[in-house]
């Protein structure tokens, strides 16, 4: 159905291809999380990262570039 399963960690890449839906699981999760591209209204939401949308919760989520962290990838990792 065009969905993919990836680990939703901050590895610098967005799960799946741009615009496609995807699912992620972590060892602690029982159920899959479904992601899609973020609405364009969030184009500036992730400061140093890429945005994905948690479909069930209707919330944006950031995958940070290396060296950044925080909800919006707004903080610099001084130890990186």
């Amino acid at each position: 159905d065009g969905n993919t399963t990836r680990t939703p960690e901050t590895n610098g890449s967005l799960c799946g291809a741009p615009g496609e839906n995807c699912t992620g699981t972590t060892p602690r999760q029982k159920s899959k999380t479904h992601f899609s591209r973020c609405p364009k209204q969030y184009k500036h939401y992730c400061i140093h990262g890429r945005c994905r949308f948690v479909m069930d919760e209707q919330t944006p989520s950031c995958i940070c570039e290396k060296g950044y962290f925080g909800a919006r990838c707004e903080q610099v990792d001084l130890f990186y």
Epitope: G19, S36, P39, Q41, Y42, Y45, M55, T59, P60, R72
Partner: antibody
Framework: QVQLVQSGAEVKKPGSSVKVSCKAS????????ISWVRQAPGQGLEWMGG????????VYAQKFQGRVTITADESTSTAYMELSSLRSEDTAVYYC??????????????WGQGTLVTVSS | DIQMTQSPSSLSASVGDRVTITCRAS??????LNWYQQKPGKAPKLLIY???NLQSGVPSRFSGSGSGTDFTLTISSLQPEDFATYYC?????????FGQGTKVEIK
């Protein structure tokens, strides 16, 4: 239960301004995006703009840019919409509407009762 | 701006009929689409969010489908209280835009 209560009907002269208020109760006011949507007599719905929580500021439709100001007073849980340089085509019912999201503007799950603004000389 | 086009603009139907309203976006909006019902003199009411999710308290005879540019609102068995005007709305990008509305009238 969330409630949005708007100020009463207004009659204004062309060229003047109007400020409509929207008082929220029953929810965490500052967490959600408040938008303003208008509806001219017999017409459809038109989004004017709204306050976006993650931005911490208002975003406006280009059509109203420079003529509308949307603000919020968290201490009184009240949102305001001020429209200036009024013309007859601004005669409409103005609604405040709360977004279902604490991030951006998504679905409007709660609406005010509407405020009729009549612009007439 | 993203243009939203609804069809038909009005329709006549009887109680018990299956009614379908379509909404087309001028560009792909994924599933970032909502449906509202509005009755005369009243504020709109949210029916469906994110294209296919039923808002709490809305009867299950309402359903939504679609993705990309083409979306559908279906009322499986029209009830007397369903005669109203229906609007779609996209929330992909600013400005938020609505369809022009579809008025469902009694045949």
């Amino acid at each position: 239960q969330v409630q949005l209560v708007q100020s009463g009907a207004e009659v204004k002269k062309p060229g003047s301004s109007v400020k409509v208020s929207c008082k929220a109760s029953g929810g965490t006011f500052s967490s959600y995006a408040i938008s303003w949507v208008r509806q001219a007599p017999g017409q459809g719905l038109e989004w004017m703009g709204g306050i976006v929580p993650w931005m911490g500021e208002a975003v406006y439709a280009q059509k109203f840019q420079g003529r509308v100001t949307i603000t919020a007073d968290e201490s009184t849980s009240t949102a305001y919409m001020e429209l200036s340089s009024l013309r007859s085509e601004d005669t409409a019912v103005y609604y405040c509407a709360r977004s279902s999201s604490t991030y951006g503007i998504h679905a409007f799950d709660y609406w005010g009762q509407g405020t009729l603004v009549t612009v007439s000389s | 701006d993203i243009q939203m086009t609804q069809s038909p603009s009005s329709l006549s139907a009887s109680v018990g009929d299956r009614v379908t309203i379509t909404c087309r976006a001028s560009q792909s909006i994924s599933n970032f689409l909502n449906w509202y019902q509005q009755k005369p003199g009243k504020a709109p009411k949210l029916l469906i969010y994110a294209a296919s999710n039923l808002q709490s308290g809305v009867p299950s005879r309402f359903s939504g489908s679609g993705s990309g540019t083409d979306f559908t609102l279906t009322i499986s068995s029209l009830q007397p209280e369903d005669f109203a005007t229906y609007y779609c709305q996209q929330y992909d990008d600013f400005p938020m835009t609505f369809g022009q509305g579809t008025k469902v009238e009694i045949k």
